[in-house]
């Protein structure tokens, strides 16, 4: 069951799908491993880099996209690859680094003036229209592209935290990702213990806000390891 994996908290500056797990009782649902919570560990350091397997772009970091590592390679084996810089070849927006988008097979700058005309009338401010698309581009690229135009408000669909307005982060919620509030002092957070321990998840909390860190609540020190309550506390 998913009872042990329904709540989690994204670590600051890491891609939204990252997160550990905390129990959320009473949720009667079962799921295959891919649909609601891609999960896995995307916390990679330069000196210990290991390719992260993925199924879709959202599972990768802000500066990555999901694809087969070799041209014409096994389509079943995909990993997170470094995003393409300006003027590099691309097939979709997600391949281009933040601040760029894919046009005519080339990553080009998505600066405000250049990009505004192409998306002006296509997407509502709040993503109220679930299925808006840009000239046949996919939902993922639509949403990420749109964000150079207007930052997502709380509850808006997003791809990454940079898509959201100040004070919000992009976090997974069931089958989607939406802008959620960054955690305030005293709010419950999820502490990620060791690298590699991040459980599958479908409900993420944001990271703790400026000047706060996710620590065990003082009166919970005696509790068992598995039930320790973490909250956002002053450094």
């Amino acid at each position: 069951t998913l009872n042990s994996v329904l709540n989690s908290n994204a670590i600051k500056n890491l891609p939204p799908p990252l997160g550990g797990a905390a129990g959320h009782p009473g949720s009667a649902v079962s799921a295959a491993p891919g649909i609601l919570y891609p999960g896995g560990n995307k916390y990679q350091t330069i000196d210990n880099y290991q390719p992260y397997p993925c199924a879709e772009d959202e599972e990768c970091g802000t500066d990555e996209y999901c694809a087969s590592p070799t041209r014409g390679g096994d389509a079943g084996v995909q990993i997170c690859l470094a995003c393409r810089k300006r003027r590099k070849r691309c097939m979709r927006h997600a391949m281009c680094c933040p601040g760029n988008y894919c046009k005519n097979g080339i990553c080009v700058s998505s600066d405000q003036n250049h990009f505004r005309g192409e998306i002006e009338e296509t997407i509502t401010e709040s993503f109220g229209n679930d299925h808006s698309t840009l000239d046949g581009y996919s939902r993922r690229t639509t949403l990420s592209s749109k964000m150079y135009h207007t930052k997502g408000q709380e509850g808006s669909v997003c791809l990454r935290s940079s898509d959201c307005a100040s004070g919000l982060c992009c976090a997974r919620h069931f089958w989607s990702k939406i802008c959620k509030p960054v955690l305030k002092e005293g709010q419950v957070c999820t502490k990620h213990r060791r690298k590699g321990s991040h459980g599958l998840e479908i409900f993420q909390r944001c990271y703790c806000g400026e000047g706060l860190s996710c620590r065990i609540q003082k009166d919970h020190h005696q509790a068992s390891n598995s039930s320790r309550l973490h909250t956002c506390q002053r450094h």
Epitope: L2, L6, H24, G26, S27, A28, V29, A31, A32, P33, G34, I35, L36, A55, E56, F127, N129, D130, H131, T133, G136, S138, R139, R140, E154, G155, V157, H173, F174, W175, S176, I178, I202, F203
Partner: antibody, heavy 117, light 107 residues
Framework: EVQLLQSAAEVKRPGESLRISCKTS????????MHWVRQMPGKELEWMGV????????SYNQKFKGHVTISADKSSSTAYLQWSSLKASDAAMYYC??????????WGQGTLVTVSS | DIQMTQSPSSLSASVGDRVTITCRAS??????LNWYQQKPGKAPKLLIY???RLHSGVPSRFSGSGSGTDFTLTISSLQPEDFATYYC?????????FGQGTKLEIK
């Protein structure tokens, strides 16, 4: 324009199998999750489950798990809900709904399933 | 599962009236509440998502408020086309669950 066109009403006997469909158009089928929702006569809506058409992954409400199967065919941009053995209590209106956010924005017109001996 | 309880179950009102429908969750669901409108023989339509965000194409006379466990759908000035059944839905915890509905009838 997003459109979800569901198959026609069905009249079945208990124990029979059934598959109803939801054909989509106006968007890229694999980019949105597809949900099935049941509404028994005069009752509220019940979420049955969801499928990610891009990879076939499914998730079910525990209440319906094992009794129904959700599937999708990418080539025809169609989602399916099927029963291997219908019960009288399966008589209801069934809706498909496709979405990206945690809400159901686009709905099919519904398929009425009648089960009687 | 989280239980959603709507009140009243039915409501009679006149065109131009201000109408309020409430929805109570059995546990805290933060802002993860949606409202739908359903007319007889038709599929539901999304009105409001994430507690108060108006879905595209929905008239501004509809509004949502509340937080935690108690939520409200308000129609500021009833129009003839607003007579229907309204459902709330929580999407805080799987499985998503709906209220039993509030039938809004013409007085």
């Amino acid at each position: 324009e997003v459109q979800l066109l569901q198959s026609a009403a069905e009249v079945k006997r208990p124990g029979e199998s059934l598959r109803i469909s939801c054909k989509t158009s106006g968007y890229t089928f694999t980019e949105y999750t597809m949900h099935w929702v049941r509404q028994m006569p005069g009752k509220e809506l019940e979420w049955m489950g969801v499928i990610d058409p891009s990879n076939g992954d499914t998730s079910y409400n525990q209440k319906f798990k094992g009794h129904v199967t959700i599937s999708a065919d990418k080539s025809s941009s169609t989602a399916y809900l099927q029963w291997s053995s219908l019960k009288a209590s399966d008589a209801a209106m069934y809706y498909c709904s496709s979405t990206t956010g945690p809400w159901f924005a686009s709905w099919g017109q519904g398929t009425l399933v009648t089960v009687s001996s | 599962d989280i239980q959603m309880t709507q009140s009243p179950s039915s409501l009679s009102a006149s065109v131009g009236d201000r109408v309020t429908i409430t929805c109570r969750a059995s546990q805290d669901i933060s802002n993860y509440l949606n409202w739908y409108q359903q007319k007889p023989g038709k599929a539901p339509k999304l009105l409001i998502y994430y507690k108060s965000r108006l879905h595209s194409g929905v008239p501004s006379r509809f509004s949502g408020s509340g937080s935690g466990t108690d939520f409200t759908l308000t129609i500021s000035s009833l129009q003839p086309e607003d007579f229907a059944t309204y459902y709330c839905q929580q999407v805080h915890t799987l499985p998503p669950t709906f209220g039993q509905g509030t039938k809004l009838e013409i007085k």
